[in-house]
């Protein structure tokens, strides 16, 4: 007799991808556009992206530090009506992307709470977040809550009304926050929060504390369903140097959780490239006209339309993790092992009951290394094969497709793989 | 300063093993790799692994596989290394030599310990 | 494993007079992510242990003379030291720093004419 097949977990539509973050509608759309009729336009390409939401804004009224002048249920006019809203939230519908709206209230000023009004900007989010739920919004990004007082309690109400009004609903809370501790105890306090925080930006130039951080982190937080960042509203180029953005990647992706980027980091978009340009939010680089700023500063591999005719870009390559993330049983919402393989490298399995399985082989090295893959680590339920297919490298000049023997895998410096082998009973 | 300060030099017979101790000062210990590196007399250098003291994670060089164990203590921030089953052709100066984390080149190097094997 | 090998075995150069050594690895160490090559120089004397010179092929460790340079790309490599000092009278290895097994040269003895 066939053994009984595992029963499939209840899956949320942001357990089954990558969430995508837009929260400077001008420096996204670039050439002195930024509108929300403007962003309707981009939507083929996030879906080319094969992302499942699109996190939004700030996109309300908000004059500087001024709670008077804050009014969380306008948009602001340079964005848009509520009409061009209705009309993005229709369109992005059609192509199965859902819409988070960012409503971090002082997002323009000092401090994005108004430390000193605290349970008038508590009222306003709360008459927020009905008024746009009931607009049709999938869910709310709250950043900063470092800077909440009794942010614990107060998500805890916010999360009532979203899960009240649907559980398909979801809220977003991010914190600058890198210290595990206050991330459990927010986390702790609220079931179905999904958290983005700096945790993985203590990782490291070099990526060696990767490893370490990932499983004291999944270790910690158990059962729980958790998203993967490395800052709350950053790009990835913000912290990691260029040979690591490919490696982060395809962990990010492969890694139990719903894995958050912002704008850019699909093609590796990076301020310190663009002179005079805001770290936090520097034009997205469409073409190369782009940044017409300095002459000659942006070459065509740096922008979508480059990358995008190149298959081993990193555009691409983001393409293709996203692509296998939202349809693959075991990186949807298989269990997960790491397990030793030698110094700089860090491996881990993807398997859900009897779907093909994922082997993860990243080396954080500088040097090319031999896998030692300690497979006497891994549960029965999760044995290695002797072979492998790989799906694909993070760098070229692999054969794609090819099975290799796990017994002499050799990686090259920096080099990320991803192997899919079957189910065997 | 940076300082890799290893253990006496040792006489064993064939068969047996030996464990070189490798003491590292004035760094971070589990922020760099340790390495093992051999120089027979007047002969040139022969790696033979890499330790992450971090982690303990290990990688060795195909000739010595099965026989060298590379080991930390983190808590003393030392480095061991000990091969087994010592051959005449063992005979030789062992160095410990760290690398900044992920390099394969070594910026700080002990002073050596010789390891005789006669019977 | 990548093989290192090294050339002449020994060298007498005059005091003052620029000193040559080559190295050929027997595959390219030239990474293409990062367009750099991973090969170091070492500088060893009587009953001390190396001391690292250069590496990525041609950046010197702080501390050393500008007098020592490294060049080369691919599989061809070259250390030169611009004028001889006396304190240069060593033996001096290459080594791969691109995979393990790292690998050395056999070395190059320098010595004063």
């Known amino acids: 007799r066939a053994p009984r097949c595992r029963e499939l977990p209840a899956q949320k539509w942001w357990h089954t991808g990558a969430l995508y973050r837009i929260g400077d509608l001008q420096a996204f759309q670039g050439h002195g556009a930024g509108n929300l009729a403007g962003l309707k336009g981009r939507l083929d390409y996030l879906s080319s992206l094969k992302v499942k939401g699109l996190v939004l804004g700030p996109i309300h009224k908000n004059q500087k530090d001024d709670v008077a002048q804050t009014d969380l249920l306008q948009i602001d006019p340079n964005f848009g009506s509520k009409e061009d809203f209705d009309s993005l939230l229709q369109s992005a519908k059609k192509k199965s992307i859902r819409v988070i709206l960012d409503l971090t209230p002082n997002y323009r000023g000092e401090n994005s709470w108004f430390s000193t009004q605290v349970d008038t900007v508590a009222t306003k989010v709360k008459d927020a977040l009905e008024f746009w739920l009931q607009a049709g919004v999938d869910g709310f990004q709250v950043r900063d809550i470092e800077n909440l007082k009794d942010a614990s309690s107060f998500l805890a109400e916010w999360q009532n009304i979203t899960k009240g009004f649907s559980e398909d609903r979801l809220l977003i809370a991010g914190t600058n926050s890198s210290d595990l501790q206050q991330i459990l105890s927010l986390l702790e306090s609220n079931k179905d929060l999904l958290l983005t925080s700096s945790y993985l930006s203590d990782s490291g130039s070099t990526g060696e504390h990767t490893k370490s951080l990932v499983t004291q982190y999944l270790n910690a937080t158990g059962n729980r369903w958790c998203s993967w960042s490395l800052s709350q509203a950053r790009l990835l180029t913000s912290f990691l140097p260029a040979q690591l953005l490919r490696l982060y990647q395809l962990m990010l992706f492969t890694l139990p959780g719903t894995p958050v980027f912002s704008y850019g980091d699909e093609i590796g978009l990076d301020a310190a490239a663009l002179p005079g340009q805001p770290m936090e939010a520097p034009v997205m680089l469409w073409d190369e006209s782009s940044f017409p700023d300095i002459p000659g500063a942006v070459s065509a591999n740096m922008t979508v339309k480059g990358q995008s005719e190149d298959p081993g870009s990193l555009l691409s390559l983001f393409r293709r993790l996203s692509d296998q993330r939202s349809k693959e049983r075991s990186l949807l919402h298989g269990d997960f092992h790491a397990f030793s393989a030698g110094p700089g490298l860090f491996s881990y399995i993807r398997h859900w009951d009897q779907n093909e399985r994922f082997l993860v082989v990243l080396n954080f090295g500088d040097v090319g290394l031999s896998a030692g893959l300690q497979a006497s680590d891994l549960p029965a339920s999760a044995s290695l094969p002797a072979k492998a297919d790989l799906l694909l490298s993070t760098q070229p000049g692999r054969e794609e497709g090819s099975p290799l023997e796990l017994e002499r895998l050799k990686l090259e410096p920096h080099e990320g793989l991803l192997l899919r082998f079957p189910y065997a009973a | 300063q940076v300082q890799l300060v290893q253990s006496g030099a040792e006489v064993k017979k064939p068969g047996a093993s030996v464990k070189v101790s490798c003491k590292a000062s004035g760094y971070t210990f589990t922020s760099y790799w340790m390495n093992w590196v051999r120089q027979a007399p007047g002969q040139g250098l022969e790696w033979m692994g890499i330790?992450?003291?971090?982690?303990?994670?290990?990688n060795y060089a195909q000739k010595f596989q099965g026989r060298v164990t590379s080991t930390v203590d983190k808590s003393i921030s030392t480095a061991y290394m000990e091969l087994s089953r010592l051959r005449s052709d063992d005979t030789v100066v062992y160095y410990c030599?760290?690398?900044?984390?992920?390099?394969?080149?070594?910026?700080?190097w002990g002073q050596g310990t010789l390891v005789t094997v006669s019977s | 494993d990548i093989v290192m090998t090294q050339s002449p075995d020994s060298l007498a150069v005059s005091l003052g007079e620029r000193a040559t050594i080559n190295c050929k690895s027997s595959?390219?160490?030239?990474?293409?992510?990062?367009?750099?090559?991973?090969l170091a120089w070492y500088q060893q004397k009587p009953g001390q242990p190396p001391k690292l010179l250069i590496y990525f092929a041609s950046t010197r460790e702080s501390g050393v003379p500008d007098r020592f340079s490294g060049s080369g790309s691919g599989t061809d490599f070259t250390l030169t030291i611009s004028s001889l000092q006396a304190e240069d009278v060593a033996v001096y290895f290459c080594?791969?720093?691109?995979?393990?097994?790292?690998?050395f040269g056999g070395g190059t003895k320098v010595e004063i004419k």
């Open positions: 030599a760290r690398a900044s984390y992920g390099k394969g080149y070594f910026d700080y």
């Open positions: 330790i992450d003291p971090s982690d303990s994670e290990t």
């Open positions: 595959q390219s160490l030239l990474n293409n992510i990062n367009q750099k090559n991973y």
């Open positions: 080594q791969q720093h691109y995979s393990s097994p790292f690998t």
